[in-house]
């Protein structure tokens, strides 16, 4: 039995997968910040988690996926306000009783030290210093991401 949040996440991810391939992104769009091979957009307004998920989708992006502790720290370094929380693309899957990224993968328990409960209708937010479990209905800011296309150097055969 999937929760409404899980259904929303799956629907949006599937619709993103169905869309036609777009040319690779070489530079971050205006107002997006580059962090390594990603472009990040930090919202200024607030939304519940599922609206944030939908908003990123309309921007041809996704809620932030964090690969490891190192990426978390670098992302947190871009947060300029101490007390402000941002949704990322991680929520609690009731059916699998585990934290699940919106791309379908499960959280490696070593990656993030989450403060708060792992339970139904819980979604993950980050601040400048911590990672929190919040009710998904809480209205806070959010972070969208777009992947940058790596520029490969052309290799010319010996002349």
């Amino acid at each position: 039995q999937k929760s409404s949040i899980e259904k929303c996440s799956v629907d949006i991810q599937q619709s993103r997968n169905k869309t036609t391939e777009r040319p690779g992104l070489l530079n971050c769009p205006i107002y997006w910040q580059q962090l390594r091979e990603k472009c990040l957009l930090f919202s200024h307004t607030v939304n519940p988690w599922n609206n944030s998920l939908a908003d990123c989708s309309t921007k041809e992006s996704s809620l932030l996926l964090i690969r490891d502790k190192d990426e978390l720290i670098h992302t947190q370094n871009l947060i300029r306000d101490k007390a402000i929380l941002f949704w990322i693309g991680l929520n609690f899957s009731l059916s699998e009783k585990n934290w699940k990224w919106i791309n379908g993968s499960f959280l490696n328990s070593n990656d993030l030290e989450i403060r708060g409960d792992a339970k139904e209708n819980s979604c993950i937010s980050i601040s400048q210093t911590s990672v929190y479990s919040e009710y998904c209905s809480t209205e806070i800011r959010w972070i969208c991401q777009k992947e940058l296309t790596p520029v490969r150097n052309k290799v010319y055969p010996d002349s």
């Epitope: 205006i30 107002y31 957009l41 930090f42 919202s43 200024h44 307004t45 607030v46 609206n51 939908a54 908003d55 309309t58 921007k59 300029r80 306000d81 402000i84 209205e139």
Partner: antibody
Framework: QVQLQESGPGLVKPSETLSLTCTVS????????WSWIRQPAGKGLEWIGR???????NFKPSLKSRVTMSVDTSKNQFSLKLRSMTAADTAVYYC???????????WGQGTLVTVSS | QSALTQPPSASGSPGQSVTISCTGT?????????VSWYQQHPGKAPKLMIY???KRPSGVPDRFSGSKSGNTASLTVSGLQAEDEADYYC??????????FGTGTKVTVL
Amino acid sequence: QVQLQESGPGLVKPSETLSLTCTVSGGSISSYYWSWIRQPAGKGLEWIGRIYTSGSTNFKPSLKSRVTMSVDTSKNQFSLKLRSMTAADTAVYYCARDPLGSFFDYWGQGTLVTVSS
Amino acid sequence: QSALTQPPSASGSPGQSVTISCTGTSSDVGGYNYVSWYQQHPGKAPKLMIYEVSKRPSGVPDRFSGSKSGNTASLTVSGLQAEDEADYYCSSYADINNLVFGTGTKVTVL
């Protein structure tokens, strides 16, 4: 280059409703916030409210009871309705693009609205 | 939420610098890094000069810079030019339902 153009009546009678439309050209209306701002003659700017292309809205608390906003993505337009107009509502009304919900990077040229019987 | 406080006027000779202050509270300027600045020439729409306290949109000369300390934000125009003569307004996010502007400052190039 994104351009915004306000349209609507220049004269409104007291107690009537002001209806303004902003047409966006040179770019898509989607995935942005769109705001209305007004400026009485010789005075400062006042934010009225914003609408997102999903239709969600936020309004300045003191004006909330009188304001309605709507968006028509198919026409690349968004609209403002301000009820129970009084002389204090006489101002130049601007529409503006609000990319992240806290600042305005493209503005219409403004339309003067006078409230008078 | 009342308007942010700006000095009514500021002036400087060509080539000099002028700094405009914008004072709010911990609920607006002090609470967020979402301060912006606008330039308005008579009879024209405002133009964005600075956003997120200190970021400059493309096309805005680097003579314009923004900063913030506590509840007060500042706009500095260095190397003042005749075309910089205008009204300047600050603005700050206050909450999801409120965005406040400053009272405005008239900058005169002497």
